[in-house]
């Protein structure tokens, strides 16, 4: 049970987390004016990764795309490819711990089989989620680098009692949501990859079935266990129970001292 | 189509306060701007300050201790409260839609608002 | 506060000639996230409210003939009447519309001579 728990979680996080890095990757404030020098400005300006914005107090927003890719900077770009990847490892990884969920049953999938492809997805959310949390990491040192530089030259042309303010950008709701949804993903992706070791099937060096003494009145049935080919593919034995309120995830995997018959 | 239309006492005693109030029509209060511009006989004109859609204001410096402007959006109107007036208060009082490039693109008629004793 | 600066404070020009009225602000009035320049003119006639004639230092509001024309950038912009006309005959206002309070200049007055 702990195992479904926890894989189904790591699936909904990642979910979440994804779903937050595509947000982050399409909005427009990645960076925003800063109003710090200004507060009373009637004209709003700010970024995302493929279009600038400007808002008038009237009311009236206009954006304009990035319609060059050559003239661009190469750490937008960077940003641009960072995110991008992040989304498509993301994706693929959803779509992959979608058929590795516990609780969907596909076929005569194993759970070998099933175990493989939740590492798989974790490793894969994990990736994505780092990328994402590159990507906004590399933006935010961008915008803190060029808002010191506007700031040690803040007032360009001083001639005479003419002054032009330079416009300063500072980070924008975007940075935090991929920021956060970066973090969902990457312990999405770990919970994934937690789950997983719980759904391996365990390899043991003997063949020798055993069985839980446990303080309960348990009757152990020979027939319980379900025939196993050897220590390859599905070595994890199931066992039955009279008293059986315990599923098959909640069945402890560390030996102990009345582990052996 | 749009409009705007001043209305209030013409006339205004010293240290009181002159309320005004623009009555638009053809457009949203809640997605347009008005703003507040007065000229004193024989000059030039003075923005006092706006109210913007969604309910944010901006006045002038020079009047931020006396003037407030609010309104009320199902009645479709804006209004205006100078506190403490003196005759240099005395002008034509304009209401105005903001528009693109926060110019000012509709204007009422005016009104003259007269402060003596 | 930006103060707005304008000249001449009266213009007389022959009717069918170019009348030029400049404004200068104390303060850049060029936007950098889309690099228009929020500066406003109006025509304001004796008895009348202001009308609207251009904003974006450059862009005609619609309805307002094409012999006049606004241009400059910055902190320097230029309002241009390519002929001039009976009808206009009336002070013109230019407006700073980037930093509040959005200010106006002291306004030129145009006379036919």
């Known amino acids: 049970m702990a195992v479904t728990a926890c894989q189904g979680l790591g699936f909904v996080v990642s979910l979440i987390g994804i779903a937050g890095i595509i947000a982050a990757t399409c909005m427009d404030q990645w960076s925003t004016q800063d109003l710090y020098n200004n507060p009373v400005t009637a004209v709003f300006n700010y970024q995302g990764l493929w279009r600038s914005c400007v808002r008038e107090s009237s009311g009236f927003t206009e954006c304009r795309g990035y319609f060059t890719l050559l003239g661009l900077p190469a750490m937008l770009q960077a940003v641009r490819a960072l995110m991008i990847v992040g989304i498509v490892l993301g994706a693929i990884g959803l779509l992959v711990s979608i058929f590795a969920l516990k609780c969907i049953r596909i076929g005569s999938m194993e759970d070998s089989a099933k175990a493989n492809m939740t590492l798989t997805s974790g490793i894969m959310f994990i990736v994505s989620g780092l990328c994402a949390i590159a990507g906004v990491s590399v933006f935010a040192n961008m915008l803190v680098t060029n808002f010191w530089m506007s700031t040690a030259n803040m007032y360009t042309g001083m001639g005479g009692m003419v002054q032009t303010v330079q416009t300063r950008y500072t980070f924008g709701a975007a940075l935090f949501v991929g920021w956060v949804a970066g973090g969902l993903t990457l312990i999405g992706g770990v919970m994934m990859c937690i789950a997983c070791r719980g759904l391996a099937p365990e390899e043991t060096n003997y063949k020798a079935v055993s069985y839980h003494a446990s303080g309960h009145s348990v009757a152990y049935k020979p027939g319980g266990f379900k025939a196993s080919t050897g220590f390859g593919s599905n070595t994890k034995n199931k066992k039955i129970y009279d008293g059986g309120a315990r599923t098959e995830d909640e069945v402890q995997s560390y030996p102990s001292k009345h582990d052996y018959v | 189509q749009v409009q705007l239309q001043e209305s209030g006492p013409g006339l205004v005693k010293p240290s009181e306060t002159l309320s005004l109030t623009c009555t638009v029509s053809?457009?949203?209060?809640?997605?347009?701007?008005v703003s507040w511009v007065r000229q004193p006989p024989g000059k030039g004109l003075e923005w006092l300050g706006v109210i913007w859609g969604d309910g944010s204001t901006n006045y002038h410096s020079t009047l931020i201790s006396r003037l407030t402007i609010s309104k009320d959006t199902s009645k479709s109107q804006v209004f205006l409260k100078l506190s403490s007036v003196t005759a240099a208060d005395t002008a034509v009082y304009y209401c105005a839609k903001a528009g693109r490039g926060n110019a000012l693109d509709y204007w009422g008629q005016g009104t003259l608002v007269t402060v003596s004793s | 506060d930006i103060v707005m600066t304008q000249s001449p404070d009266s213009l007389a020009v022959s009717l069918g000639e170019r009348a030029t009225i400049n404004c200068k602000s104390s303060?850049?009035?060029?936007?950098?996230?889309?690099?228009?320049?929020?500066l406003t003119w109006y025509q304001q006639k004796p008895g009348q409210p202001p009308k609207l004639l251009i904003y974006w230092a450059s862009t005609r509001e619609s309805g307002v003939p094409d012999r006049f024309s606004g241009s400059g950038s910055g902190t320097d912009f230029t309002l241009t009447i390519s002929s001039l006309q009976a009808e206009d005959v009336a002070v013109y206002y230019c407006?700073?519309?980037?930093?509040?309070?959005?200010?106006f200049g002291g306004g030129t007055k145009l006379e036919i001579k």
């Open positions: 053809g457009f949203s209060l809640t997605s347009y701007g």
């Open positions: 303060q850049s009035l060029l936007n950098s996230g889309n690099q228009k320049n929020y």
């Open positions: 407006q700073n519309d980037y930093s509040f309070p959005l200010t």
